[in-house]
């Protein structure tokens, strides 16, 4: 059932990175507007993005309340200028989204190498602990705060003069690696949640190389 001249939304898609979560859909509206509702499996529906002509709705504020819950959204279509109008079944046309569990599905954002420090033949590489929009006690939690033991980082490093890459892993945000004295190295890191089946890895961080500003070199 539906209202004359309204079409149901389709291709409802969750776009989420580090819990910043937006629902997108099609089509671009022609003489119609949309309202989005979101709910947990056991909860009540909450309306967002009322009578919008956009084809996206930021649902971050709702999902960060409990990132381990499974959420469902639906997009209602209304005729522009007549939002009280309903279909023959007595309700506006709507389409359901796929289920979305932020903790298991949000994409891991591109990490950043915060610093590296060389002491003799050891280099300590620190990954920035990126802030998320998940809150606890009025403070924003970092990615490590939220994912805890489920989050690891992989470090790729290589001599500036060659292409052979080595890897290291850490379940903290720091690596301590052995390097050859007198050689410059380049570094890139990747966030990984090994226990996931989807969106397991982030994109690689920008490459940082020794001899540039971020690092510090101490000959011991």
């Amino acid at each position: 059932s539906g209202t004359t001249n309204t079409v149901a939304a389709y291709n409802l898609t969750w776009k989420s990175t580090n819990f910043k979560t937006i629902l997108e859909w099609e089509p671009k509206p022609v003489n119609q507007v949309y309202t989005v509702q979101i709910s947990t499996k056991s909860g009540d529906w909450k309306s967002k993005c009322f009578y919008t002509t956009d084809t996206e709705c930021d649902l971050t504020d709702e999902i960060v309340k409990d990132v381990k819950q499974t959420y469902l959204a639906r997009v209602f279509s209304y005729p522009a200028g007549n939002v009280e109008s309903t279909g023959s079944a007595g309700e506006p046309l709507y389409e359901n989204s796929p289920e979305f569990t932020p903790y298991l599905e949000t994409n891991l954002g591109q990490p950043t190498i915060q610093s590296f420090e060389q002491v003799g033949t050891k280099v300590n590489v620190t990954v920035e602990d990126e802030r998320t929009l998940v809150r606890r006690n009025n403070t924003f939690l970092s990615l490590r705060d939220v994912f805890g033991k489920d989050l690891i980082y992989t470090l790729y490093y290589w001599k500036s003069s060659s292409s052979g890459k080595k890897t290291a892993k850490t379940n903290t945000n720091e690596f301590l690696i052995d390097v050859d004295k007198g050689e410059n190295y380049c570094f890139s890191v990747q966030a990984v949640i090994p226990s996931r089946t989807v969106n397991r890895k982030s994109t690689d961080s920008p490459v940082e190389c020794m001899g540039q500003e971020k690092g510090e070199f101490r000959e011991i």
Epitope: K41, K68, Q69, T70, T101, Y103, L104, V134, R136, L141, R144, D145, V146, F147, G148, K149, N171, T172, P194, S195, R196, T197
Partner: antibody
């Protein structure tokens, strides 16, 4: 409210296998690690392994590798722990547990009532 | 595998304060070990008190507090009651597995 309901007591012969179940309710089953911990009579707690139901990812205590298998059935929100090649020293109460998630609190907040497994010839 | 060490037994007077410690054979305990504290009273099921180093469960009285002190995880109990008499287990995470300590039998006397 979070509940973990375990299966009933079992008596097994040495060399046999046992499969203990843990039915979860009151939360999103897929998102939380379920831990398995055992306690032999008069002894302390011993971690056996864990499973994340959403992906079936598992981690096992080296001591039990090859003998323990953890699985899940998402349709019934149930996790299973199977221990094979039983010996008398496997006589213990077997618990499932789940963390209390508040940011990243991991571990052993909620506990099942325990399943007594007795291995005796 | 790492070994987690706790005091075998401790005694505290009613109303007193006691500190239980949890050491790791691999070195300093850090927040990456996600220290857990589990209480087990005689004949009862284990009960989670603290997880993730310092997060109390909703049922955990504010008289219990978890922290890291120096190189070890610590459970502090203020204003001990007789009902706090129990065995307290510490568990630490090591990259891909948990290890429990042997437990501390706390007597309130």
């Amino acid at each position: 409210q979070v509940q973990l309901q375990e299966s009933g007591a079992e008596v097994k012969k040495p060399g046999a296998s046992v499969k203990v179940s843990c039915k979860a309710s009151g939360y999103t089953f897929s998102s939380y690690w379920i831990e398995w911990v055992r306690q032999a009579p008069g002894q302390g707690l011993e971690w056996m392994g864990e499973i994340l139901p959403g992906s079936a990812s598992t981690k096992y205590n080296e001591k039990f590798k090859g003998r323990v298998t953890m699985t899940r059935d998402t349709s019934t929100s149930t996790v299973y722990m199977e221990l094979s090649s039983l010996r008398s020293e496997d006589t213990a109460v077997y618990y499932c547990a789940r963390d209390y998630y508040y940011g990243s609190s991991y571990g052993f907040a909620y506990w099942g009532q325990g399943t007594l497994v007795t291995v005796s010839s | 595998q790492a070994v987690v060490t706790q005091e075998p037994s401790l005694t505290v007077s009613p109303g007193g304060t006691v500190t239980l410690t949890c050491r790791s054979s691999t070195g300093a305990v850090t927040t990456s070990n996600y220290a857990n504290w589990v209480q087990q009273k005689p004949g009862q099921l284990p009960k989670g008190l603290i997880s993730g180093t310092n997060n109390r469960g909703p049922w955990t009285t504010a008289r219990f507090s978890g922290s890291i002190l120096g190189d070890k995880a610590v459970l502090t109990l203020w204003g001990a009651h007789t009902e706090d008499e129990a065995v307290y287990y510490c568990a630490l995470w090591y990259s891909n597995h948990w290890v429990f300590g042997g437990g501390t039998k706390l007597t309130v006397l």
